[in-house]
């Protein structure tokens, strides 16, 4: 067995509606049937969990109903979307992939995607 590599883009710019999407790709060393994907946010040296989902290979990725994340999976690739972002949420978002079953367990951690969020300018009042 060998270490699991996780790749993700270095930088992503959120849309004006506060939505950011990026791909998290992992090189699976084994034949995993159950995979857990977690998005972590690193600010200073503090790491917090943004969202997490466990899925069976071949099935769809399902986040909790109240999660700010959605995603789809295809093979060893996960397309992640984070919604409701504000300027203060700008930061490094790390993709963590765990091959949960069958043993052995593997952990892979991406280098992080720097997501930049710019709050939209409020619309000026229209003069009619």
């Amino acid at each position: 067995c060998k270490a699991m590599h996780v790749a993700q883009p270095a930088v992503v710019l959120a849309s004006s509606r506060g939505i950011a999407s990026f791909v998290c790709e992992y090189a699976s060393p084994g034949k995993a049937t159950e995979v857990r994907v977690t998005v972590l946010r690193q600010a200073d040296s503090q790491v917090t969990e943004v969202c997490a989902a466990t899925y069976m290979m071949g099935n769809e990725l399902t986040f909790l109903d109240d999660s700010i994340c959605t995603g789809t999976s295809s093979g060893n690739q996960v397309n992640l979307t984070i919604q409701g972002l504000r300027a203060m949420d700008t930061g490094l978002y790390i993709c963590k992939v765990e091959l949960m079953y069958p043993p052995p367990y593997y952990l892979g951690i991406g280098n992080g995607t720097q997501i930049y969020v710019i709050d939209p300018e409020p619309c000026p009042d229209s003069d009619f």
Partner: antibody, heavy 118, light 108 residues
Framework: QVQLVESGGGVVQPGRSLRLSCAAS????????MHWVRQAPGKGLEWVAV????????HYADSVKGRATISRDNSKNTLYLQMNSLRAEDTAVYYC???????????WGRGTLVTVSS | EIVLTQSPGTLSLSPGERATLSCRAS???????LAWYQQKPGQAPRLLIY???SRATGIPDRFSGSGSGTDFTLTISRLEPEDFAVYYC?????????FGPGTKVDIK
């Protein structure tokens, strides 16, 4: 602040069973993998077992596979280790430790001593 | 199983000296998944370094970690009296998670 407190250790005869507990506080228990690590007197650290998140996935060291059962109660923020068919070589201090979100073992309890002797 | 080998087994040094501890893995370990711990007699281990080179909260900057692949190093730039202890490396990327046998740093 994060706290892990083990209990349940003691002297037990070979072949008997023991259940260790670890009471956790100060963090969101269900977001972390929880591990048991042991240390025989005068020896190094040996990883024993882990239970992940909701408790549905568990992994064990070969030395305890088939004799140990790790479990967790997320409603009570408590980790357990049931050890059966105990052997002299299971004598050790058993530590409960938290897996950080990035995987490393960031907080450790003070340990509970298990002595297997007749 | 990934086997970790630490060298030397014992390092005898004086306060103020530099300590270099080695950890070698039997197969490649992701640098994201290599940690170093310090343990003093009668105490639980304490996390020093994670991700091969990141210092844990509250760890003085005289401790540094480096390396990748199969070779990792913990360096203590200037030994303080409280640094004399046993140091373990650990990989947490693949189960079973394994520790090295430890390096004891004692006073010369």
């Amino acid at each position: 602040q994060v706290q892990l407190v083990e209990s349940g250790g003691g002297v037990v005869q070979p072949g008997r069973s023991l259940r260790l507990s670890c009471a956790a506080s100060g963090f969101t228990f269900s977001s972390h993998g929880m591990h048991w690590v042991r240390q025989a007197p005068g020896k190094g650290l040996e990883w024993v077992a882990v239970t992940w998140y909701d408790g549905s996935n568990k992994h064990y060291a070969d030395s305890v596979k088939g004799r140990a059962t790790i479990s967790r109660d997320n409603s009570k923020n408590t980790l357990y280790l049931q050890m059966n068919s105990l052997r002299a070589e299971d004598t050790a201090v058993y530590y409960c430790t938290r897996g950080d979100l990035l995987g490393y073992f960031d907080y450790w309890g003070r340990g509970t001593l298990v002595t297997v002797s007749s | 199983e990934i086997v970790l080998t630490q060298s030397p087994g014992t390092l005898s040094l004086s306060p103020g000296e530099r300590a270099t501890l080695s950890c070698r893995a039997s197969q490649s370990v992701s640098s994201s998944c290599l940690a170093w711990y310090q343990q003093k007699p009668g105490q639980a281990p304490r996390l020093l370094i994670y991700g091969a080179s990141s210092r844990a909260t509250g760890i003085p900057d005289r401790f540094s970690g480096s390396g990748s692949g199969t070779d990792f190093t913990l360096t203590i730039s200037r030994l303080e009296p409280e640094d004399f202890a046993v140091y373990y490396c650990q990989q947490y990327g693949i189960s079973p998670f394994t520790f090295g046998p430890g390096t004891k740093v004692d006073i010369k």
